[in-house]
Amino acid sequence: HNTTVFQGVEGQSLQVSCPYDSMKHWGRRKAWCRQLGEKGPCQRVVSTHNLWLLSFLRRRNGSTAITDDTLGGTLTITLRNLQPHDAGFYQCQSLHGSEADTLRKVLVEVLADPLDHRDAGDLWVPGESESFEDAHVEHSISRSLLEGEIPFPPTS
């Protein structure tokens, strides 16, 4: 699997999409996990509804939400109020019993807020109490890492 990079701005929401073959993964729940180290395990962050039929319902764990379009074959993860510590490697997974198939490997990059330390004026920033549905979702920038490419090249 190549790694797809998704970039989001600190404090805003980032939407990660993982396309998959809906027939191949029919009836299977999905999950979003965080890779702990290069060879380490992938720690489950959130998974879709226990009843596959209800996978379209948004489930959340803290600032992360997941929803699955099982007909269209797209798993969507929303990271709300993105913080620097959210940066790192993740996976979208398809679950079959105790097994987990990787649908997509993801690198989340958090960019500094360009409006930071400036007068935000009338800019609306979603409050902590507001729901995912109301949160403003930034269109994420994504690209695939080339084979052998270093995700964070050293700066000269």
């Epitope: 027939m23 009836g27 596959w52 039929l53 079959h96 019993g97």
Partner: antibody, heavy 122, light 107 residues
Framework: EVQLVQSGAEVKKPGESLKISCKGS????????IAWVRQMPGKGLEWMGI????????RYSPSFQGQVTISADKSISTAFLKWSSLKASDTAMYFC???????????????WGQGTTVTVSS | DIQMTQSPSSLSASVGDRVTITCRAS??????LGWYQQKPGNAPKRLIY???SLPSGVPSRFSGSGSGPEFTLTISSLQPEDFATYYC?????????FGQGTKVEIT
């Protein structure tokens, strides 16, 4: 009509190779997993493995891993089960079956081939 | 691997009898279980999927129940064509596994 039609009976000698087939019709063959099931004479059913013809993703039962090869050619809507060196203990009936798709999720094995008898004897 | 323990291995019954066959999984399989009927010389036929759902064309005298570790196939009134061998199959985890089978014979 959704159908899986298997190749005919085979009589082989130990050490010989063999490839049997299972041709799907009446549905989108690449979009459904195909399983292989063994039934030795007078015995029960044993799940050997499964393949998704769309991308040839394959899973094997540990009991059959390394003993057989499961493959598929979606261009001719056919799945295959292959032995490189047959043993007398491979004598059995072999079934292919399609994993069903139901509104509520997967539906087990909903359509079965008629079976292929393989006899291995010196 | 998940073991499926099916009981009884055989039973004798008469036409009109109520017959119950049980399958027990060695670990949780949700409702990812099907029941299959096989007659001598024929391919198996699916009778029940998702533990309790009846495919179209299967007579309503067949029913499935249970979840978690224990599942049951019931034939409410045995008919002459029901004398066969019955298998359960779990498709929750690889490798999928069948029960040992239950042969239903005429008394």
């Amino acid at each position: 009509e959704v159908q899986l039609v298997q190749s005919g009976a085979e009589v082989k000698k130990p050490g010989e190779s063999l490839k049997i087939s299972c041709k799907g019709s009446g549905y989108s063959f690449p979009s459904y997993w195909i399983a292989w099931v063994r039934q030795m004479p007078g015995k029960g059913l044993e799940w050997m493995g499964i393949i998704y013809p769309g991308d040839s993703d394959t899973r094997y039962s540990p009991s059959f891993q390394g003993q057989v090869t499961i493959s598929a050619d979606k261009s001719i809507s056919t799945a295959f089960l292959k032995w490189s060196s047959l043993k007398a203990s491979d004598t059995a009936m072999y079934f292919c079956a399609r994993q069903g798709i139901e509104v509520t999720g997967t539906g087990g094995l909903d359509v079965w081939g008629q079976g292929t008898t393989v006899t291995v004897s010196s | 691997d998940i073991q499926m323990t099916q009981s009884p291995s055989s039973l004798s019954a008469s036409v009109g009898d109520r017959v119950t066959i049980t399958c027990r999984a060695s670990q949780g399989i949700r409702n990812d279980l099907g029941w299959y009927q096989q007659k001598p010389g024929n391919a198996p036929k699916r009778l029940i999927y998702a533990a309790s759902s009846l495919p179209s064309g299967v007579p309503s005298r067949f029913s499935g129940s249970g979840s978690g570790p224990e599942f049951t196939l019931t034939i409410s009134s045995l008919q002459p064509e029901d004398f066969a061998t019955y298998y359960c199959l779990q498709h929750n985890s690889y490798p999928w596994t069948f029960g040992q089978g239950t042969k239903v014979e005429i008394t």
